[in-house]
């Protein structure tokens, strides 16, 4: 799986979507989960609704929201008041009894708030990133 | 046990190479980052570079491009660096280091060095 | 390359003491900075990962903050043990780059 950037500004909202087969997926949860560094174990974030006739139902846990549209086949993922401690690793999942394929693997940067001037002095302008040459970026 | 364990001290001279290796112990090579890094008596740490032992992608600072090769055996567990073109100033405590890359690993595995001496 | 330095090179302090090290990098990191301790002979040990979670079985008087350029790590209460030598390290990108180190000594 390549890498998906989405980058979004602190203090703002993220919304992350995945798009995937409908078919090959009818039937099936879907969730969003942490990874800790790019090999680490993905811990669960927040999953979709326990009925599946129900993905469409936004569930939330703390920050992040999560709805399917499992007609479209759209997974849409939405962090609220993004902060710092927020980027990382993620993972879009389809999940199969105790089993997780893996949708789309996301990287999430946090770009400071150009209208905060406490670091006026320090604004960064994002690049690309070194490690994903060859990854997409979303904005 | 998880642990890493590095090869023995070693004299070199001037010019020559050295090849240190790394074992690991209670996990799979295949599952981390292997890093090396390298600390001149009473200075800091260096970062040399790593290898994905699962790929066989290797990366390394600019400083030790063409003169370090980090490599991995994964049916061994095992990681080597080996540098070449050995000068005086390379005289160092040589460490592995083993995590889930960048981006929040919560893995962190170390060996317990390897001190090489160059010297003619 | 990003460049860390650490802030104070070394420093004297007495058992129960409040210790705080600053680390100042060149480009911002976001929170990809971790915090080392070392003792003399030994590798070094995983305080702090990402800027602010400390990692298995280190002592809760240990903290980290900040992000994008300035990152601090505290220790509330320094205790015998934690005389060493601390080192922060950037995770945002290759080369990964260690600050120069700062050597906490019995005042």
């Known amino acids: 799986h390549n890498t998906t950037v989405f980058q979004g500004v602190e203090g703002q909202s993220l919304q992350v979507s995945c798009p995937y087969d409908s078919m090959k997926h009818w039937g099936r949860r879907k969730a969003w989960c942490r990874q800790l560094g790019e090999k680490g174990p993905c811990q669960r974030v927040v999953s979709t609704h326990n009925l599946w006739l129900l993905s469409f139902l936004r569930r939330r846990n703390g920050s992040t929201a999560i709805t399917d549209d499992t007609l479209g086949g759209t997974l849409t993922i939405t962090l609220r008041n993004l902060q710092p401690h927020d980027a990382g690793f993620y993972q879009c999942q389809s999940l199969h009894g105790s089993e997780a394929d893996t949708l789309r693997k996301v990287l999430v940067e946090v770009l400071a708030d150009p209208l905060d001037h406490r670091d006026a002095g320090d604004l960064w302008v994002p690049g690309e990133s070194e490690s994903f040459e060859d990854a997409h970026v979303e904005h | 046990q998880v642990q890493l364990v590095q090869s023995g001290a070693e004299v070199k001279k001037p010019g020559a190479s050295v090849k240190v290796s790394c074992k690991a112990s209670?996990?799979?090579?295949?599952?981390?980052?292997i890093h090396w890094v390298r600390q001149a008596p009473g200075q800091g740490l260096e970062w040399m570079g790593w290898i994905d032992p699962e790929q066989g992608e290797s990366k390394y600072a600019p400083k030790f491009q063409g003169r370090a090769t980090i490599t991995a055996d994964t049916s061994t567990s095992t990681a080597y660096m080996e540098l070449s073109s050995l000068r005086s100033e390379d005289t160092a405590v040589y460490y592995c280091h083993a995590d889930h890359g960048n981006y929040g690993s919560t893995m962190d595995y170390w060996g317990q060095g390897t001190l090489v001496t160059v010297s003619s | 390359d990003i460049q860390m330095t650490q802030s104070p090179s070394s420093l004297s302090a007495s058992v129960g003491d409040r210790v705080t090290i600053t680390c100042h990098a060149s480009?911002?990191?976001?929170?990809?900075l971790s915090w080392y301790q070392q003792k003399p002979g030994k590798a070094p040990k995983l305080l702090i990962y990402?800027?602010?979670n400390l990692h298995t079985g280190v002592p809760s008087r240990f903290s980290g903050s900040g992000s994008g350029t300035d990152f601090t790590l505290t220790i509330s209460s320094l205790q015998p043990e934690d005389f060493a030598t601390y080192y922060c390290q950037q995770g945002q990108t290759y080369p990964r780059t260690f600050g120069q180190g700062t050597k906490v000594e019995i005042k």
């Open positions: 990402k800027a602010s």
């Open positions: 480009q911002h990191i976001n929170v990809w």
């Open positions: 209670g996990f799979s090579i295949e599952d981390f980052y």
